[in-house]
Amino acid sequence: HNTTVFQGVEGQSLQVSCPYDSMKHWGRRKAWCRQLGEKGPCQRVVSTHNLWLLSFLRRRNGSTAITDDTLGGTLTITLRNLQPHDAGFYQCQSLHGSEADTLRKVLVEVLADPLDHRDAGDLWVPGESESFEDAHVEHSISRSLLEGEIPFPPTS
C-alpha cells in the first residue's frame, strides 16, 4: 500500500476518505486506527456501527468521527479541532472476524494556523456542544508518498 498524505490546519477539521471495492468488502465493518511505530500495532481509534446495515450512521470517539457509505464504497473519517498531536500514520481497515485488511495507509500532517497571529476573538473555535455536522470541514489536501519516500523516519 502507498501512503496517502492528508494535510489539515490546526484547529480546523480534516476529512480523510478511503475508497474501497464495495462488493469485495460487502458486510464488513470498518475501522480507523493509529499506527504506533513502523512495526508496532495499529491502535483502534473508532469503528463503524456494530450493525453493518447501519454503517452510514456517524460514530464518534472524542474528536474523531467515522461514517461508511457501504453502497458507494467510501469510508470517511473526520478529525475535528485538529491538533499537532493528531499528526502521524493511520490506517483505514476492513474488519472480518479477528482479522483486518488495510484499505488505505494515511499520513496526517497538521499545518500551523495562518491566522494564529490574530486575536483569539477573530478565531472561530467549535464549541463542545456543536455536532460534527455543524463543524466546518476544510477541503483536505492529499497526495501519495512518492516511491522512495520513507513513511517512517529511520530510528537511530
Epitope: W26, H49, L51, W52, L53, L54, L57
Partner: antibody
C-alpha cells in the same frame, strides 16, 4: 393505504419451526428495510432482526438471542418479508410484529420504524 | 449492550397536565433515540425520531429532547387518547428499548 399484515403465528412445541409472513401494500416494498420485533406477554419490546432494502441484496442482522435460529428473508415480487424460526424455545413466546424502517434516499434508511403490522401471536409450549 | 432506563415505570395525570418521561442510556448515544406510543392490544406507533424530530402526522403536543445519555419525552397537555405505554429506543449500538412508561388518567 400503507399497510403491513403479519400471519403464520400459532401454537408450536419447543424445538419445532414456524414461518411468519409480513405482507406489505401501499408502498414500494423494495425501497425499504424491514424489521421484526417481538413482545412477550406483559413485557416490553425487543428487536429481533432486520433485512436491508433491495439495494442491500438481502443482507440481514439479528439480535444475539436468535442468531443462528431465526432467518429473515424477503420476496420482492410478492412484497412479503418472512421470519423463519427454527429450534423454538418457550422464551420465544411473544407477539411478533413486522415494521418498516424510515427511508432517507436510495439505499439509505433510518432505524426508526414508521409503519407496523398488527402483530401475530406465537406460543411455544409443550 | 446499551441499557435504557426509563422512568417512571407508570404515572397517573389529569387531562391537560404536562407529562414528562425520562430515558437514560448506559453510555453516550448522541441523539440516536426514538420514542414510540403503544396502546393496549395495538402495535407501537413512532412519535419522535433522532431524539427531537416529530414524526409526520403526530400532534405537536408531543416533543422530545436530550443528547448523550439523558433524554426527555413530553406531552404538553395530556389528552384522553394519550393513554398508552411509551417506549424509548436507541440505535447507537444494536437496537434496544427502554422498559416502558404506562400513562393513565387520574
Amino acid at each position: 393505504e400503507v399497510q403491513l399484515v403479519e400471519s403464520g403465528g400459532g401454537l408450536v412445541q419447543p424445538g419445532r419451526s414456524l414461518r411468519l409472513s409480513c405482507t406489505a401494500s401501499g408502498f414500494t416494498f423494495g425501497d425499504y428495510a424491514m424489521s421484526w420485533f417481538r413482545q412477550a406477554p406483559g413485557k416490553g419490546l425487543e428487536w429481533v432482526g432486520f433485512i436491508g432494502s433491495k439495494a442491500y441484496g438481502g443482507t440481514t442482522e439479528y439480535t444475539a438471542s436468535v442468531k443462528g435460529r431465526f432467518t429473515i428473508s424477503r420476496d420482492g415480487s410478492k412484497s412479503i418479508a418472512y421470519l423463519q424460526m427454527n429450534s423454538l424455545k418457550t422464551e420465544d413466546t411473544a407477539v411478533y410484529y413486522c415494521a418498516r424502517g424510515k427511508r432517507y434516499s436510495y439505499g439509505y434508511w433510518h432505524p426508526a420504524f414508521d409503519v407496523w403490522g398488527q402483530g401475530t401471536m406465537v406460543t411455544v409450549s409443550s | 449492550d446499551i441499557q435504557m432506563t426509563q422512568s417512571p415505570s407508570s404515572l397517573s395525570a389529569s387531562v391537560g397536565d404536562r407529562v414528562t418521561i425520562t430515558c437514560q442510556a448506559s453510555q453516550d448515544i448522541t441523539n440516536y433515540l426514538n420514542w414510540y406510543q403503544q396502546k393496549p392490544g395495538k402495535a407501537p406507533k413512532l412519535l419522535i425520531y433522532d431524539a427531537s424530530n416529530l414524526e409526520t402526522g403526530v400532534p405537536s403536543r408531543f416533543s422530545g429532547s436530550g443528547s448523550g445519555t439523558d433524554f426527555t419525552f413530553t406531552i404538553s397537555s395530556l389528552q384522553p387518547e394519550d393513554i398508552a405505554t411509551y417506549y424509548c429506543q436507541q440505535y447507537d449500538s444494536y437496537l434496544t428499548f427502554g422498559g416502558g412508561t404506562k400513562v393513565e388518567i387520574k
